[in-house]
């Protein structure tokens, strides 16, 4: 008799999930020699232990503590780039500006980026059919709790000037319900962080509006100011030129506004 299996609303675990996590770990430690102390098999065991045999709607930050411990690494606290709804450009930026870090440039973020995973209560199986959706099923699912945990710790580590890249093409440029809006903003430490600088990325070629005046940006400014952190905002009118100028800052066209 086939065992009844809970059907969730979200996509199932990414195929070859264990192999992918292990391979990414090995690759990361090869690229980043300062992470040579990491035992990737132990990392996978800790990752697996966070969600295997547990109800996928009942995952806690505590479940991820062993993994958090193994994934510990030094990140320059004044070189942190947060992002919301504009991951690709943020990652392109840190690939060029190598001394800055997004969460996905750290081991834990790199391991989990773009992956989905969940298990089943009381069985050691990984569920490749479906996983809980944050909205339709439950928020305490393995993927959401993982990102909440690492995002909180990443934001806590930040100091001096923290940058955040925001998508100016979205109706809510700053979204209180995003990971940035619901987790990272509230875990910046005012005793360490002097300024949050938002970079609003424009989508349209002819878009010359000052998106720093957008009501949602004003809302972000209000939240940040109430936390005794200064706020500044810059429009990035030409993201392609912006990246080009990060690569070649001496270029004569890079002195004008981008």
């Amino acid at each position: 008799v086939p065992r009844w299996r809970q059907q969730w609303s979200g996509p199932g675990t990414t195929k070859r999930f264990p192999e992918t996590v292990l391979a990414r770990c090995v690759k990361y430690t090869e690229i980043h020699p300062e992470m040579r102390h990491v035992d990737c098999q132990s990392v996978w065991d800790a990752f697996k232990g966070a969600f295997i045999s547990k109800h996928p709607c009942n995952i806690t930050e505590e479940d991820y503590q062993p993994l958090m411990k193994l994934g510990t690494q030094t990140v320059p606290c004044n070189k942190i780039l947060l992002w919301s709804r504009i991951k690709d450009l943020a990652h392109q930026f840190t690939q060029v500006q190598r001394d800055m870090f997004t969460l996905e440039d750290t081991l834990l973020g790199y391991l989990a980026d773009d992956l989905t995973w969940c298990g089943e209560f009381n069985t050691s199986k990984i569920n490749y059919q479906s996983c809980p959706d944050w909205r339709k099923d439950c928020s305490n699912n393995p993927v959401s709790v993982f990102w909440k945990t690492v995002s909180r710790r990443f934001a806590e580590a930040a100091c001096d000037v923290v940058h955040v890249m925001l998508n100016g093409s979205r109706s809510k440029i700053f979204d209180k319900n995003s990971t940035f809006g619901s987790v990272e903003v509230h875990n910046l430490q005012p005793e360490k962080v002097q300024t949050l600088e938002a970079w609003v990325i424009h989508g349209g070629r002819e878009d010359s509006r000052d998106l720093c005046q957008d009501p949602t940006i004003k809302e972000l400014e209000s939240i940040i100011s109430k936390r005794n952190i200064q706020f500044s905002c810059k429009n990035i009118y030409r993201p392609d030129k912006f990246l080009q100028c990060v690569k070649n800052p001496e270029d004569s066209s890079c002195t004008s506004e981008i």
């Epitope: 102390h37 990491v38 035992d39 132990s42 958090m68 411990k69 193994l70 994934g71 510990t72 690494q73 030094t74 990140v75 320059p76 606290c77 750290t106 834990l108 690492v150 710790r153 990443f154 806590e156 580590a157």
Partner: nanobody, 116 residues
């Protein structure tokens, strides 16, 4: 907060040895990684060695086989034993401690000078 105090730096002849110590102001059980970085004059700070709570270690290629990192949790201290020192090891050596996955604390640094 974690305060770190390095000691043991000094002037040594090429081929000689030194042991650096770094005392932490809190129980090192709660410190997930302890390590050493160094900065030579006019150069960027570079990673030297790390040790995690499980005792796993990692070393930069430039020091592998010559340097050894260890930690004594009872004394809240991490050590860096440096052997076969070379003039290019001359730098300020900084101790680091990482808690809660990413929050990194730095010591003030101790000068190591290797004369030829």
């Amino acid at each position: 907060q974690v305060q770190l105090q390095e000691s043991g730096g000094g002037l040594v002849q090429a081929g000689g040895s030194l042991t650096l110590s770094c005392a932490a102001s809190r129980n090192t059980d709660s410190i997930e990684i302890m390590g050493w970085y160094r900065q030579a004059p006019g150069k960027q700070r570079e990673w030297v060695a790390t040790i995690n709570t499980g005792g796993n270690t990692g070393y930069a290629d430039s020091v592998k086989g010559r340097f050894a990192i260890s930690r004594d949790n009872a004394k809240n201290t991490v050590y860096l034993q440096m052997h076969s020192l070379k003039p290019e090891d001359t730098a300020v050596y900084y101790c680091t401690a990482v808690i809660r996955t990413y929050s990194t604390y730095w010591g003030q640094g101790t000068q190591v000078t290797v004369s030829s």
